[in-house]
Interface confidence: low
């Protein structure tokens, strides 16, 4: 007769793992006794437990509460067993031992790997913003064992660096994602893909870009020159930026205090019914926690009585 | 507010181990990484090795071989070891706290450590 | 590892000066640089990280930039209690510290 074992049996962290022993004997031949012992190189043989045929199973005090007989219906050919709710110490060699009457003695070896599933993390790099040169955007770190792979997916263009701690029982891979912000990746999803043969799927943890900037200020409501006339209603200058965080605007007039009845609404400034007064320079000054910027508009509120008395002086004048 | 505490011998022997301790206080080292620093009697600084938040370590690659950093979390305190210590291991070894990056944003007070028979 | 140039190694200014400490790197570290301040006796203490953020607490006169492998630390209008010497440090991979720059009163 001979044995049947596995070379290599696989097992996640905390599952169970069945250790096979099979005796496949010629028709009459019996199974007396299994003995299951941890035989790692360097150390001696540590008994795990004793199958007897008649007296049943016997589990060294190491392993008490821990090793079982599969459930029934047993074969009693069978020599083999379950190790409950394995740990990363169990992972090495298993040697079974069958006595069989009237063959004698057999022996076969497995190997045990406990598959360790990685907790991936991500740690986001220093803010982002525009105007800096390649720059840590991200790191994932996913420790395991074997050593789990740390990819990232992304539609945004960039460079990873990964490199790896090894540990007794594991390793550490962390992957680094390095890009050029620029204000287009703003909200812009960056994934860690953590993959491993203990996971049923890949894990993956997403960051979500933010980039600070401050665009370029400009003042729109000065389109039409005309429209600024003496006694004109409902007047407005509207301040037109853009950035993250999003900014706070403010208003003033470099040429003196704004005058009275202007009012300022964020980035809009309201005028009351129009004066000469209300000529002058306006500026609006944009600002966030990145950068800041300034544009300037000058208002010349036009008299219509003015521009009649030239036509008629110029029409007398023909 | 953040406190990082060192005690140790000041004295160690030639081929003996230096053991220095780190207690904590202000924060959670499951929070946070504790790493240890030394700087010899007037010359610059030496990076040695850290335990993370999540209790891995890494350690300096030239001195990897004689150092050993555990923690008892349940103390707030990180344990510093170095064994076959030398008279070129004299300086000031220092504990320090960082984040998930390795700069340091808190320090231990320092402790003088003389290898001299 | 990845080497720390700092220079100069020691300086001597007044009271008002503006200060330049600069840091090369043998590889390119994606400002993943730090900035220390130490005093004779005392432990080091943090002043700029990922090499432009101001840590809690420094005074705005200090300030750090550059990217690559070259790096600045900038004093502006110097004080009394800035004397003492400087450490850059990277943190991208193991981390090594510079040599270290002594600023002295003149």
């Known amino acids: 007769g001979e044995l049947e074992t596995s070379d290599v049996v696989t097992v996640v962290l905390g599952q169970d793992a069945k250790l096979p022993c099979f005796y496949r004997g010629d028709s009459g031949e019996q199974v007396g006794q299994v003995a299951w012992a941890r035989v790692d190189a360097g150390e001696g043989a540590q008994e795990l437990a004793l199958l007897h045929s008649k007296y049943g199973l016997h589990v060294s005090p190491a392993y008490e509460g821990r090793v079982e007989q599969p459930p029934p219906p047993r074969n009693p050919l069978d020599g083999s067993v379950l190790l409950r709710n394995a740990v990363q110490a169990d992972e090495g060699e298993y040697e079974c031992r069958v006595s069989t009457f009237p063959a004698g003695s057999f022996q076969a070896r497995l190997r045990l790997r406990v598959l360790v599933p990685p907790l991936p993390s991500l740690n986001p790099g220093p803010a982002l913003e525009e105007g800096q040169g390649l720059t840590l955007a991200a790191s994932c770190t996913a420790e395991g064992s074997p050593a789990p792979s740390v990819t990232w997916d992304t539609e945004v263009k960039g460079t990873t660096s990964s490199r790896s701690f090894k540990h007794s029982r594991s390793a550490a891979v962390t992957s680094e994602f390095h890009l050029v912000p620029s204000r287009s990746m703003n909200g812009q999803p960056l994934t860690c893909v953590v993959s491993h043969p203990g996971l049923l799927q890949d894990q993956r943890i997403t960051h979500i870009l933010h980039v600070s900037f401050l665009a370029e200020a400009s003042v729109r409501g000065l389109e039409d020159q005309n429209l600024w006339h003496i006694g004109r209603e409902g007047a407005m200058l509207k301040c037109l930026s853009e950035g993250q965080p999003p900014p706070s605007y403010n208003w003033t007039r470099l040429d003196g205090p704004l005058p009275s009845g202007v009012r300022v609404d964020g980035d809009t400034l309201g005028f009351p019914p129009l004066t000469t007064e209300h000529s002058g320079i306006y500026v609006c000054h944009v600002s966030n926690e990145f950068s800041s910027r300034d544009s300037q508009v000058t208002v010349d509120v036009l008299d219509p009585q003015e521009d009649s008395g030239k036509q008629v002086d110029l029409v007398s004048a023909s | 507010q953040v406190q990082l505490q060192q005690s140790g011998p000041g004295l160690v022997k030639p081929s003996e181990t230096l053991s220095l301790t780190c207690t904590v206080s202000g924060f959670s080292l499951t929070n946070y990484g504790v790493h240890w620093v030394r700087q010899p009697p007037g010359k610059g600084l030496e990076w040695l090795g850290v335990i993370w938040s999540g209790g891995s370590t890494d350690y300096n690659p030239s001195l990897k071989s004689r150092l050993t950093i555990s923690r008892d979390t349940s103390k707030n305190q990180v344990s510093f070891k170095m064994s076959s210590v030398t008279a070129a291991d004299t300086a000031v070894y220092y504990c320090?706290?960082?984040?998930?990056?390795?700069?340091?944003?808190?320090w231990g007070q320092g402790t003088l450590v003389t290898v001299s028979s | 590892d990845i080497q720390m140039t700092q220079s100069p190694a020691s300086l001597s200014a007044s009271v008002g000066d503006t200060v330049t400490i600069t840091c090369r790197a043998s590889?390119?570290?994606?400002?993943?640089l730090a900035w220390y301040q130490q005093k004779q006796g005392k432990s080091p203490q943090l002043l700029v990280y990922?090499?432009?953020n101001l840590a809690d607490g420094v005074p705005s006169r200090f300030s750090g930039s550059g990217s690559g492998t070259q790096y600045t630390l900038k004093i502006n209008s110097l004080q009394s209690e800035d004397f003492g010497t400087y450490y850059c440090?990277?943190?991208?991979?193991?981390?090594?510290f510079g040599g270290g720059t002594k600023v002295e009163i003149k």
């Open positions: 590889q390119n570290i994606y400002s993943n």
């Open positions: 320090a706290r960082s984040g998930k990056w390795y700069y340091f944003d808190y």
């Open positions: 440090q990277h943190f991208w991979g193991t981390p090594t």
């Open positions: 990922a090499a432009t």
